[in-house]
């Protein structure tokens, strides 16, 4: 027989990594092998995620917790606790239907995952490019050509060259 | 190193009392290690005594033989789990186990102790 | 739940197969451990839900069955195999965790 203290509703009694069997008197029975109640009273024990193919076990199932998954190398995840696994892409390029595309000119994308986005535009900001974008790198805006007027540098001048051997004083 | 250890066995009179303790050290009880208590009288099989649900709650699983004479306890700060046996009868000599059930090994029993006798005896 | 198993006991030679069964009183799906216990020595665990192997036990040994029906099977008895084999429901509850009676397998 099983005993529990407490005269409340005998369900309510059964902690986590257990279920309310109805069909054995509502006893608290542990959760079989591979699955788990990751709360008390529950009614069943859910069966366990397993990760396989593509992806890979984070974290094991326990009595009171689900497995976690996440991504092969070469795959990233995507959704909410990692639903789905979607190819890594190089720096450059974006996920298409038809696998990875480098990005167009004018679009840049610095991650292995995602899509390729426009370059900044500078004058939108009143400034002018300071280096240009490529399919890795966002543009780098400087000063507005304004700042750039016969006497401004945009460059900061060398320091001053020291004499071999000297130490700063 | 992971183990269970068994004490407080000995002689002990019918109608006596002995409360026995399992140690554990290794790993903590919770809700995929249950402690369990089985025994084995000379000369013959293994016997189901019961187990207590291994985290916080008070849930224990007994066999029907044991009729409320046999209790079976828990301390966490300890990590160590009790068998308390009442109106002892010479039926109860036996080698007593401690033994860990595991969700992992489908609630087998993974892990034992070495065991601590009992005889009971006028 | 009743556990039965048989034979109580066998007589074998290494190199022999050997089957043991184990029959509950009631279903208890695949909730079914096996043990080997030697004289003097606490028991090990062989084989856990029916039929999975555990850690460290040599692929000699196999389990299978589901419900009420359960086999053991060593392939190629060897040496050390010579003991006392046991069957357990891990089905809790209800008197629900209760040994099989044991098969003693000895040298022929």
């Known amino acids: 027989f099983e005993r529990t203290r407490s005269l409340q509703d005998p369900c309510s009694n059964c902690p986590a990594g257990t279920f309310c069997d109805n069909n054995r008197n509502q006893i608290c029975s542990p959760c079989p092998p591979n699955s788990f109640s990751s709360a008390g009273g529950q009614r069943t024990c859910d069966i366990c995620r397993q990760c396989k193919g593509v992806f890979r076990t984070r974290k094991e199932c326990s009595s009171t917790s689900n497995a976690e998954c996440d991504c092969t190398p070469g795959f990233h995840c995507l959704g909410a606790g990692c639903s789905m696994c979607e190819q890594d892409c190089k720096q450059g390029q974006e996920l298409t239907k038809k696998g990875c595309k480098d990005c167009c000119f004018g679009t840049f994308n610095d991650q292995k995952r995602g899509i390729c986005r426009p370059w900044t535009n500078c004058s939108l900001d009143g400034k002018s490019v300071l280096v240009n974008g490529t399919k890795e790198r966002d543009v780098v805006c400087g000063p507005s050509p304004a700042d750039l007027s016969p006497g401004a540098s945009s460059v900061t001048p060398p320091a001053p060259a020291r004499e071999p051997g000297h130490s700063p004083q | 190193e992971v183990q269970l250890v068994e004490s407080g066995g000995g002689r002990v009179q019918p109608g006596g009392s002995l409360r026995l303790s399992c140690a554990a050290s290794?790993?903590?009880?919770?809700?995929?290690?249950?402690p369990c208590w089985v025994r084995q009288a000379p000369g013959k099989g293994l016997e189901w005594i019961g187990c207590i649900y291994g985290g916080s709650s008070d849930i224990t699983y007994d066999a029907n033989w044991t009729k409320g004479r046999f209790t079976i306890s828990r301390d966490n700060s300890k990590n160590t789990v009790y068998l308390q046996m009442n109106s002892l009868r010479a039926e109860d000599t036996a080698t007593y186990y401690c033994a860990r059930s595991a969700w992992y090994s489908g609630w087998g029993g993974d892990l034992w102790g070495q065991g601590t006798q009992v005889t009971v005896s006028s | 739940i009743q556990m039965t198993q048989s034979p109580s006991s066998l007589s074998a030679s290494v190199g022999d197969r050997v089957t043991i069964t184990c029959q509950a009183s009631q279903s208890i799906s695949n909730r079914l451990a096996w043990y080997q216990q030697k004289p003097g020595k606490a028991p090990k665990l062989l084989i856990y839900s029916a039929s999975t192997l555990a850690s460290g036990v040599p692929s000699r040994f196999s389990g299978s069955g589901s419900g009420t029906d359960f086999t053991l099977t060593i392939s190629s008895l060897q040496p050390e195999d010579f003991a006392t084999y046991y069957c357990?429901?891990?089905?809790?509850?209800?008197?629900?965790?209760?040994f099989g009676t044991g098969t003693k397998v000895t040298v022929l």
């Open positions: 290794g790993f903590s009880f919770s809700a995929n290690y249950y």
């Open positions: 357990q429901s891990t089905y809790y509850g209800n008197d629900g965790n209760a």
